[in-house]
């Protein structure tokens, strides 16, 4: 990805998804009525013209926001502590890797706008999730809906990372 982002970063992302899956506490079928459109900014992860700075920034902000969301008293009360600790550790490792990368990308002179713009958009998205949890009084179903929403958005963000990685491989082999 144009910096020494360890090869296991993709593996860590997949582990995060696995952990989020394992964290399930109730049947999602009980929560159909609680579905909500959080308006995940799909255009941010779906583009074909991927810039390193943009990808790094999206992934960093996503992981930072997930870390914050699952690092609260409310979250500790809702989830299995062992799995939650593993999630915190994995997210922390990924954030450290990405911060190293972001510093290098900025050093290479990539646009600051490519970094700040996705961060603002994602903060608004996560704020909507926090408002929803509060509205729903942090119910089990609200957390379940949020867990599945985070899995979806993280999956899409990880896909974007993989697309950039394969684009870099193609350029390297040509």
């Amino acid at each position: 990805l144009g910096c020494d982002l360890p090869q296991n970063h993709g593996l860590l992302s997949r582990n995060t998804l696995v952990l989020l899956h394992q964290m399930r506490r109730i049947s999602p079928f009980l929560c159909l009525k609680d579905r909500r459109d959080f308006r995940f900014p799909q255009e941010m992860v779906k583009g074909s013209q991927l810039q390193k700075a943009h990808v790094m920034s999206v992934l960093h902000e996503m992981l930072q926001q997930i870390f914050s969301l699952f690092h609260t008293e409310r979250s500790s009360a809702a989830w299995n502590m062992t799995l939650l600790d593993q999630l915190h550790t994995g997210l922390h490792q990924q954030l450290q890797h990405l911060e190293t990368c972001l510093l290098q990308v900025v050093g290479e002179g990539e646009s600051a706008g490519a970094i700040s713009s996705p961060a603002l958009t994602l903060r608004r998205y996560f704020q909507g999730i926090r408002v929803y949890l509060k509205e729903k009084k942090y119910s089990d179903c609200a957390w379940e809906v949020v867990r599945m929403e985070i899995m979806k958005s993280l999956f899409l963000s990880t896909n974007m990372q993989e697309r950039l990685r394969s684009k870099d491989r193609d350029l390297g082999s040509s």
């Epitope: 079928f29 579905r35 929403e149």
Partner: antibody, heavy 121, light 108 residues
Framework: EVQLVQSGAEVKKPGESLKISCKGS????????IGWVRQMPGKGLEWMGI????????AYSPSFQGQVTISADKSISTAYLQWSSLKASDTAMYYC??????????????WGQGTLVTVSS | DIQMTQSPSSLSASVGDRVTITCRAS???????LNWYQQKPGKAPKLLIY???SLQSGVPSRFSGSGSGTDFTLTISSLQPEDFATYYC?????????FGQGTKVEIK
């Protein structure tokens, strides 16, 4: 390209068992639920039940609870609908369709081509 | 269960006509999770509109959806020859998921 491909038409006798399949491709199979819908000849659509292939959790319509069994094998991205003892009234077209689970996205955005089940003595 | 009632059950219209189909739920669909499907003979249903008013990708803009709570509408602004089919509404708000009985749009 997202696809749901169903098994072929079946002709069975009353009392026989049957298992039809729906194979998903072109997307993450465990990220979506699979629903089953019945359409009797010349009639409308009836939702039968649904499965979360990630852990095989199921939910059924009260009209079909105990009449059919929905299962899935995520290793081969396939969902199943089965009967232990068919009746003539089970004659219908059966569709599988993809559902986004608790995520906010279109319900049943992709459908299988349908499996025609004919039960006759 | 939430009962979905469509009206009319069938209608005859000409190419170019504006067609409106209504769907009434027996109780409020609070998050507007109401979908519309088109089905042609011998084919699987096809999603047209989701969340009451969002047009599914690839569906022509002559199709539109509106409504909230218990009353929803599918409108075809200018009927085309390929639009002659049966249309179903479906609520995705609560179990069991339920469909309307269908509205058959025929050529006048």
């Amino acid at each position: 390209e997202v696809q749901l491909v169903q098994s072929g038409a079946e002709v069975k006798k009353p009392g026989e068992s049957l298992k039809i399949s729906c194979k998903g491709s072109g997307y993450s199979f465990t990220s979506y639920w699979i629903g089953w819908v019945r359409q009797m000849p010349g009639k409308g659509l009836e939702w039968m039940g649904i499965i979360d292939p990630s852990d095989s959790d199921t939910a059924y319509s009260p009209s079909f609870q105990g009449q059919v069994t929905i299962s899935a094998d995520k290793s081969i991205s396939t969902a199943y609908l089965q009967w232990s003892s068919l009746k003539a009234s089970d004659t219908a077209m059966y569709y599988c369709a993809r559902h986004p689970g608790l995520n906010w996205a279109p319900d049943f955005d992709y459908w299988g081509q349908g499996t025609l089940v004919t039960v006759s003595s | 269960d939430i009962q979905m009632t469509q009206s009319p059950s069938s209608l005859s219209a000409s190419v170019g006509d504006r067609v409106t189909i209504t769907c009434r739920a027996s109780q409020s669909i609070d998050n507007n999770n109401l979908n519309w499907y088109q089905q042609k003979p011998g084919k699987a249903p096809k999603l047209l509109i989701y969340a009451a008013s969002s047009l599914q990708s690839g569906v022509p803009s002559r199709f539109s959806g509106s409504g909230s709570g218990t009353d929803f509408t599918l409108t075809i602004s200018s009927l085309q020859p390929e639009d002659f089919a049966t249309y179903y509404c479906q609520q995705g708000y609560d179990w069991p998921l339920t469909f309307g009985q269908g509205t058959k749009v025929e050529i006048k």
